[in-house]
């Protein structure tokens, strides 16, 4: 049962009072207000929005609301020297140029300061050369090209379709393959759902629509010039040559009309199989270069973007806890957008705004949460999670001692089919219990719980009768809290039906067409899915901040640790001979997982039996729960990724968006058969097993009786 107890207030001020105060009409109104002009990070418009949110959060009743500013490296196109791509003939004449901007959506023709499509942090350059089509530019795509097809990308410009993995990983892979430039495009196979019209008549991507986005490989560093430390007034900044994660080759995104013009001329090798074909009427030849008649033509990139140290602003609101003010539950989401941000981020920011308003209403009636709640409107998320990371770097000592949980609040919707949750196993029970108490907004599930519709539409692949809850990866503002600091984290949003809609993300992601009207007309006219997401996010925050005993269940960590140990062992056993030769044993890890399981169960027994009226014992038990996630942090970090310090989870080295379990062991095993020094490679596997086993055992011991 949820405890839902309130502090110093009448019994009516419980979770129900908080949830009942959340209104769909308010979320709709806030979304409209946040999406009328662009709010690009580092611009005056986004600074003004920060001040507006600060003022409104104060009006809503928060105890304090401050702006926290940092001077970080951002990237912008050159206003007078636009970026584009050409096809040039043998004389160097440009016979085709890609478009310089997206055709604006109806009603927005006169809006100024719409940033044209660009790949943030691309270096300047004008490379020219033959084109190679590299599918999604995933690790496995380059393996196919280089190992199976013997195609060399060195000195070539590669063209890759968006989707499947984070764009920064695509660029990194292209760099490693020796490419001298990257063209990213949205293929209709991934960004045009069959049977749906293009915007403004539907939610599909028109041919002139383009996905913006950063192409960094920061690995959790935050501002590229001040890794590990806040970009404050007295910061020491690295030189640009030493900056973290910047790409070394020019990169530019285009839409599928322009991509058609480049791809239709491709010659060379045929695509290796159907998985390399998109939906354009082109052969999807891999190249290199154009076919017969066009073989003397080349592709030329013209990139003139600049990197600039620019001021950004987070808004930090505080609702002080009545009993444990030194314990922080954080709800955070970003405010900066590429253009209008109709979905990303403002569908999330509008929900946060309404959650703040509801909490403020309760506070004005005399209520306070047990623990302190911090609300954050992050800046520069789109430029590499910079606002959240800099703030966490500045406040890391407080956070590691006082941080109970972080709930992320970016886009509330990426579809309108069912709930999607990624979180620490500590929150599984909380999410299950909460969704059982909430009404489903789904058609056909009237009078049924959200848990029921979610479980029916998105069943767990491993555990029947339960909903799917995914591992946390990255690509959003929870990263620093979870992967670096080890603060229990979670995120929730409404999503599409992944079975029937195989496109990546939502079609209009990071385009100019991500408007208020997109949401209001096509995704959520009644704002009922937004309201449900507000209830899930807000309900989690309420329970985390207000329950007497923290709503974390360490037994669920035991369950997943066993699953992950089984999985990584199975991967390793694909090399039985090497396992024997190099005496690789997983016994220590399996033993540690068993010990964790045993200790976690005994802890749970004590948790049910202890005297909750004894504040010292209560605090002690809660601290053991709070610090469990912290116990999975290795202060030395993962190999070559010092800011990814969680031993159980890290963003995949091949896709920042995805989470990988036992990432140290996984990466040590990855493609191990191709390593030049197998003895050294298997030695690293053994070292990573040792680190994982030690960490799991050490975490288990934090749950043991203290004396």
């Amino acid at each position: 049962k949820s405890s839902n107890e309130a502090t110093n207030i009448t019994p009516k001020h419980n979770m129900k009072a908080f949830l009942d105060e959340l209104k769909a009409e308010n979320i709709k109104k806030f979304l409209y207000n946040f999406t009328q002009i662009p709010h690009l990070a580092g611009t005056e418009q986004n600074f003004q929005l920060a001040k507006q949110i600060q003022s409104q959060w104060k009006e809503f009743g928060l105890d304090s609301v401050e702006l926290a500013h940092y001077d970080v490296l951002l990237s912008y196109p050159n206003k007078t020297h636009p970026n584009y791509i050409s096809i040039i003939n043998e004389d160097g004449n440009e016979i085709f140029n890609t478009s310089l901007f997206e055709p604006p959506p109806p009603g927005y023709e006169n809006v100024s300061d719409i940033v044209p499509p660009f790949s943030a942090f691309s270096p300047q350059g004008m490379p020219e050369g033959d084109l190679v089509y590299v599918n999604y530019a995933r690790t496995e795509d380059f393996f196919k090209l280089e190992r199976d097809m013997k195609i060399n990308c060195s000195g070539k410009i590669v063209i890759a379709r968006y989707g499947k993995v984070f764009r920064g990983n695509k660029v990194k892979n292209a760099q490693l393959a020796g490419a001298k430039g990257v063209i990213l495009y949205s293929d209709p196979a991934d960004y045009f759902a069959p049977g749906v019209k293009s915007y403004p008549d539907g939610w599909n991507l028109p041919g002139g629509g383009v996905q913006r986005g950063n192409i960094l490989n920061l690995n959790g560093a935050g501002d590229p010039l001040t890794p590990g430390y806040p970009a404050n007034e007295y910061a020491y900044r690295r030189g640009i040559a030493e900056a973290v994660g910047l790409p070394s080759i020019p990169v530019h995104p285009i839409g599928y009309y322009d991509a058609q013009k480049l791809l239709e001329k491709m010659g060379g090798s045929a695509p290796p199989d159907s998985s390399w074909r998109g939906s354009l009427k082109v052969p999807y030849n891999v190249g290199p270069g154009f076919t017969g008649n066009f073989s003397t033509q080349k592709v030329k990139m013209h990139i003139h973007s600049t990197n600039e140290v620019t001021r950004i602003y987070n808004v930090i609101g505080t609702l002080r806890g009545a009993v444990e003010p030194d314990r922080y539950v954080i709800l955070g989401g970003h405010r900066d957008s590429w253009v209008f941000g109709g979905i990303d981020p403002q569908s999330g920011a509008a929900v946060v705004h309404e959650i703040v308003r509801s909490f403020g209403t309760l506070k004005k009636e005399g209520w306070r949460p047990r623990r302190t709640i911090l609300f954050a409107s992050w800046d520069a998320e789109e430029f590499g999670l910079l606002g959240s990371t800099e703030w966490a770097e500045e406040n890391s000592r407080l956070l590691q001692e006082r941080g109970v949980a972080y709930i992320n609040a970016d886009s509330s919707i990426e579809g309108n089919y069912t709930l999607r949750v990624d979180c620490t196993p500590l929150m599984y029970s909380l999410v299950h219990n909460l969704t059982k108490e909430l009404k489903s907004p789904d058609e056909g599930f009237e009078g049924k719980s959200l848990y029921e519709s979610w479980t029916k539409k998105s069943p767990s692949p491993e555990f029947s009768g339960m909903p799917r809850i995914s591992k946390l990866g990255s690509g959003n503002d929870f990263e620093v809290f979870f992967q670096r600091l080890g603060i229990a984290s979670g995120r929730a949003r409404y999503t599409k039906n992944w079975e029937t809609n195989k496109f990546s993300g939502y079609p209009l992601y990071h385009s100019v067409y991500e408007t208020y009207e997109l949401v209001e007309k096509f995704y959520d006219p009644m704002f009922k899915y937004h309201l449900t997401v507000a209830q899930v996010r807000g309900g989690m925050v309420f329970e985390l901040a207000n329950s007497i005993v923290l709503p974390f269940d360490c037994r669920d960590y035991a369950v997943v640790l066993r699953k992950y140990a089984d999985k990584i062992y199975s991967i390793s056993m694909k090399h039985p001979q090497e396992m024997k030769t190099y005496s690789v044993s997983f016994d220590s890890l399996f033993s540690a997982v068993k010990n964790f399981t045993e200790i976690a169960s005994k802890f749970s027994e004590r948790l049910q039996d202890f005297d909750k009226s004894n504040p010292i014992v209560l605090r002690m038990m809660n601290d053991q729960l709070m610090f469990l996630e912290r116990a999975f942090i290795d202060p030395l970090g993962l190999p070559d990724r010092p800011f990814y310090r969680h031993v159980i989870y890290a963003p995949s080295s091949h896709n920042k968006y995805a989470g990988e379990s036992f990432p140290g062991i996984y990466d040590a095993l990855f493609d191990i058969e191709s390593k030049v020094d197998p003895s050294k490679a298997w030695g690293e596997v053994k070292r990573q097993i040792y680190v994982a086993a030690f960490t799991v055992q050490a975490a288990a011991e934090t749950l043991s009786e203290v004396a």
């Epitope: 599984y428 029970s429 299950h432 767990s460 491993e462 555990f463 029947s464 009768g465 339960m466 269940d553 360490c554 037994r555 669920d556 035991a558 369950v559 066993r562 699953k563 140990a565 089984d566 062992y569 199975s570 056993m573 039985p576 997983f586 016994d587 399996f590 068993k594 399981t597 045993e598 200790i599 976690a600 169960s601 005994k602 749970s604 027994e605 049910q608 039996d609």
Partner: antibody, heavy 121, light 110 residues
Framework: EVQLVESGGGLVQPGGSLRLSCAAS????????MSWVRQAPGKGLEWVSA????????YYADSVKGRFTISRDNSKNTLYLQMNSLRAEDSAVYYC??????????????WGQGTLVTVSS | QSVLTQPPSVSAAPGQKVTISCSGS????????VSWYQQLPGTAPKLLIY???KRPSGIPDRFSGSKSGTSATLGITGLQTGDEADYYC???????????FGGGTKLTVL
């Protein structure tokens, strides 16, 4: 003292359903994985299903996947096995067993006395 | 057909020693902990050995367990007529995500 008492067995026709219960006492029920293990007459032990402590993650033998559902009610200290689309080969004594370690199955330190399920027309 | 392989039967005279083998693979016995159960005629199984070689309280030290590679062994010394029973090995299988048992071994005390 740990006690596990199964009930709900009986005679059922092929294609029919039955719900088994296991009442547990003498330990903190919610903290331990619980399993159902069956034994056909004159045959060996066959693990059927398990449910973890905590959120109640479930595991099934291939032979019963999609037909049987394990669940638990921690407030009632009771384990259940809902058996649908029963077949003759499901006839067995069904034992409820407690895990000896914690939230996932390692070994069974306590067993109930079993309840007989007979599937026959 | 069981995932773990046991001999169908073993026999020995009272006072003698007997061993029962249990053979598996890298995904079960090879990496996971083995337990052994005794089932006397007409009764529920009872835990005899856990974690490869540990005895629950009340189990005499005549019973022992060991594991090597992908095989496990149950040893019984000083056989008594009361030891006549079926013996089962069990473990977790990391590939199947399932508990697996051996087919059982009938011990006859001659």
């Amino acid at each position: 003292e740990v006690q596990l008492v199964e009930s709900g067995g009986g005679l059922v026709q092929p294609g029919g359903s039955l719900r088994l219960s296991c009442a547990a006492s003498g330990f903190t029920f919610s903290s331990y994985a619980m399993s159902w293990v069956r034994q056909a007459p004159g045959k060996g032990l066959e693990w059927v299903s398990a449910i973890s402590g905590g959120s109640g993650s479930t595991y099934y033998a291939d032979s019963v996947k999609g037909r049987f559902t394990i669940s638990r009610d921690n407030s009632k200290n009771t384990l259940y096995l809902q058996m649908n689309s029963l077949r003759a080969e499901d006839s067995a004594v069904y034992y409820c067993a407690k895990d000896g370690v914690g939230a996932t199955p390692y070994y069974f330190d306590y067993w109930g006395q079993g309840t007989l399920v007979t599937v026959s027309s | 057909q069981s995932v773990l392989t046991q001999p169908p039967s073993v026999s020995a005279a009272p006072g003698q020693k007997v061993t029962i083998s249990c053979s598996g693979s890298s995904s079960n016995i090879g990496i996971n902990y083995v337990s052994w159960y005794q089932q006397l005629p007409g009764t529920a199984p009872k835990l005899l050995i856990y974690d490869n070689n540990k005895r629950p309280s009340g189990i005499p030290d005549r019973f022992s367990g060991s594991k090597s590679g992908t095989s496990a062994t149950l040893g019984i010394t000083g056989l008594q007529t009361g030891d006549e029973a079926d013996y089962y090995c069990g473990t977790w299988d990391s590939s199947l995500s399932a508990v697996v048992f051996g087919g059982g071994t009938k011990l006859t005390v001659l």
